[in-house]
Amino acid sequence: GSERTCCPVNWVEHERSCYWFSRSGKAWADADNYCRLEDAHLVVVTSWEEQKFVQHHIGPVNTWMGLHDQNGPWKWVDGTDYETGFKNWRPEQPDDWYGHGLGGGEDCAHFTDDGRWNDDVCQRPYRWVCETELDKASQEPPLL
């Protein structure tokens, strides 16, 4: 297939990736699906530099990222290894808190108002960030 060499309209390029920042809120699963339909994924933070870039663009607003533990282990949506990768949790987080009374614990990660991460109820309607890598094979079939 062809390769994407520049970011789509309304996406922001940074370090060979493209980012799209929502201005509305969705539950984590709906945000995840939105990104997939854009041939992208919820943002995967792999470095302090990328953390600062995303933080700068989202401001002090709760925002979903592509990290969850809905099936046990913490997993990044693109398969990046959680155990050995970059982490930026708030102190005492993640805590899988049950005190919210909504049922279950907290299985989805988001940026908090200071940029550090928290786990929260996946149904909460937070903003989200999509990411796609430049130079990766396009999802479109090649022209015949």
Epitope: P73, E92, D96
Partner: antibody, heavy 112, light 107 residues
Amino acid sequence: EVQLLESGGGLVQPGGSLRLSCAASGFSFSSYAMTWVRQAPGKGLEWVSTISGRGGHTYYADSVRGRFAISRDSSKNTLYLQMNSLRAEDTAVYYCAKQDCWGQGTLVTVSS
Amino acid sequence: DIQMTQSPSSLSASVGDRVTITCRASQDISNYLAWFQQKPGKAPKSLIYAASSLQSGVPSKFRGSGSGTDFTLTISNLQPEDFASYYCQQYHSFPFTFGPGTKVDIK
């Protein structure tokens, strides 16, 4: 590979104390809530206690509240269960568990 | 507290059979339900999380379904290694509670 290894079980008299340990490896220990579950001989599974990843929240079954204390030491990747005022009905295999993985269990026998 | 019931308490089946185990919660637990398999003298093994999500490494012959109060675990093409006890557990709210178990043995 995720591994959980319990230790500290044994024979204790009613009213006595034991501390169980669970050594964890193969995962980022402080990122996960951890749980103790027990199984009396020939019986089903009973949830005992859960502690959040950083230890800020603890939860207990009514049957052990006030007698058992769950804790964790992230520097040692170890989960603990301090069991006081033990009763005959606490006799069971005690399992340390993460959502998707269980240890092999350690047997606690309370008998005079 | 949320009570969990399972049926049947035991069942006999043959190799190759398809068996279904039912789990019922005393109140709505959404999809906060897990299934575990336990063989004699061994620790439980996690099969299903979130009512229908297969744990990594678990064969697709195990299928979980349901939401709210009624859940099922279906095991297709039963093999000798599948003869064991099966437990459901709710993790909607504390105290977490297990069903009493279903023992699947060879007919």
